[in-house]
């Protein structure tokens, strides 16, 4: 997260980290006791999922292995359209005050809505500095028309843009798959942005979760 600050303790109990061994790979969100939602470009063969602590490496955190993941069938490595994936935990997460399910959206929030993006990704770019504590930054939703003015052909349907004019505030490497939460519901998953991160007037681009609630529910049902 660029130009952010540590999240208020316990304010993001649905936030998870996907680790490769002990190394941060991506962010994600807990949908229920068995399922984590993240970005399709985060796919690996096996995951270790960190839950229940804002601090990576915290011994009190739950760590659960996951071996099965299901990318959206329309995901494209070239355009990053449909950049979402469900990861099935090998064992159930234990819900608590620090481990809660995210609220999936019942509607798409409009441009101008203030939202929070969070993650353990690098706080500097291009040189990397990975924090141990979960970082947050507030950004505003940007209309597809305004975002297309910046990204032109790179922007596809079901991509959601967010940022602050003339500001560096944005997600970065390591935040991928993590949540963009607006008015208490999950509206976006960190998908992509320009590199180096934090270019003023280059919005962050997110998978627009409100367009995929049916796929999320159908996929979890299908692979129960």
């Amino acid at each position: 997260i660029i130009d952010g600050a540590p999240c208020a303790r316990g304010s993001h109990p649905w936030q998870v980290a996907l680790l490769s061994g002990n190394q941060l790979h991506c962010g994600g969100v807990l949908v229920n006791e068995r399922w984590v939602l993240t970005a399709a470009h985060c796919k690996m063969n096996e995951y270790t999922v960190h839950l229940g602590s804002d601090t990576l490496g915290d011994r009190r955190a739950q760590r659960i292995k996951a071996s099965k993941s299901f990318r959206h069938p329309g995901y494209s490595t070239q355009t990053h359209v449909n950049d979402l994936m469900l990861v099935k935990l090998n064992s159930q997460a234990r819900l608590s005050s620090m481990v809660k399910k995210v609220r999936l959206p019942s509607r798409c929030e409009p441009p101008g809505t203030t939202c929070t993006v969070s993650g353990w990704g690098t706080t500097t770019s291009p040189d990397v500095t990975f924090p141990s504590d979960l970082m947050c930054v507030d950004v505003k939703l940007i209309s597809p028309q305004d975002c297309t003015k910046v990204y032109k052909d790179l922007l596809e349907n079901s991509m959601l843009c967010a940022g602050i004019p003339d500001s560096k505030k944005n997600a970065c490497n390591g935040d991928s798959g993590g949540p963009l939460v607006c008015r208490g519901t999950l509206q976006g998953l960190v998908s992509w942005g320009t590199f180096p991160c934090g270019q003023p007037n280059d919005p962050g681009v997110y998978t627009q979760v409100c367009k995929f609630t049916k796929w999320i529910n159908d996929t979890m049902k299908k692979h129960r």
Epitope: H41, V150, Q199
Partner: antibody, heavy 122, light 107 residues
Framework: QVQLQESGPGLVKPSQTLSLTCTVS??????????WHWIRQHPGKGLEWIGY???????YYNPSLKSRVTISVDTSKNQFSLKLSSVTAADTAVYYC??????????????WGQGTLVTVSS | DIQMTQSPSSLSASVGDRVTITCQAS??????LNWYQQKPGKAPKLLIY???NLETGVPSRFSGSGSGTDFTFTISSLQPEDIATYYC?????????FGGGTKVEIK
């Protein structure tokens, strides 16, 4: 189809400044997510990255050349330029301009100019 | 800077042969590794991006694999038009750096 075309003198005297321009057609230099690079190749050798410029004017140069390099952009002309000062014979090379799709998830050079040979000699 | 070590520096193979080139990064670059083909007097051309993704319009006999520090580029069945020099390039970190190249010739 994006096309890039380098232009500038093919012969530069030692200690002078090498100046090249890259003209972009078929795409806007102001498009977000695309960075505009200079890369060179010494005769019979490999590729050396020089630096880039973004639509905002943000630049990044190879530390090995940083003290001598300036890259600038003219969005109104859809052009970007390279200046390399205090040249020596070691700067004799084919100079390429290139576009990179440069995202957090994916970054690569997708379009290149055909290259222009610059010889440094008195 | 991240050093990219490419091997072999040159190879000679027959038409139809399987050709493999390796590239090793001096530190972890995840999958930010691209492969380019350069024919004499021409600019490099992108073949593979992000370690394993085939660029649009590139024949399927070209493939790439690997992650972290070790990467492989393969031509499954060498064709006469594949005579060229091949370069790997890391895009994980600035400055971007290239391997030394592998010159592929026909026996």
């Amino acid at each position: 189809q994006v096309q890039l075309q380098e232009s500038g003198p093919g012969l530069v005297k030692p200690s002078q400044t090498l100046s090249l321009t890259c003209t972009v057609s078929g795409g806007s230099i102001s498009s977000g997510g695309y960075y505009w690079h200079w890369i060179r190749q010494h005769p019979g050798k490999g590729l050396e990255w020089i630096g880039y410029i973004y639509r905002s004017g943000y630049t990044y140069y190879n530390p090995s050349l940083k003290s001598r390099v300036t890259i600038s952009v003219d969005t109104s002309k859809n052009q970007f330029s390279l200046k390399l000062s205090s040249v020596t014979a070691a700067d004799t090379a084919v100079y390429y301009c290139a576009r990179a799709k440069q995202l957090t998830t994916s970054r690569y050079f997708d379009y290149w100019g055909q290259g222009t040979l610059v010889t440094v000699s008195s | 800077d991240i050093q990219m070590t490419q091997s072999p520096s040159s190879l000679s193979a027959s038409v139809g042969d399987r050709v493999t080139i390796t590239c090793q990064a001096s530190q972890d670059i995840a999958n930010y590794l691209n492969w380019y083909q350069q024919k004499p007097g021409k600019a490099p051309k992108l073949l593979i991006y992000d370690a394993s993704n085939l660029e649009t319009g590139v024949p399927s006999r070209f493939s790439g694999s690997g992650s972290g520090t070790d990467f492989t580029f393969t031509i499954s069945s060498l064709q006469p038009e594949d005579i060229a020099t091949y370069y790997c390039q890391q895009a994980s970190d600035l400055p971007f750096t290239f391997g030394g190249g592998t010159k592929v010739e026909i026996k």
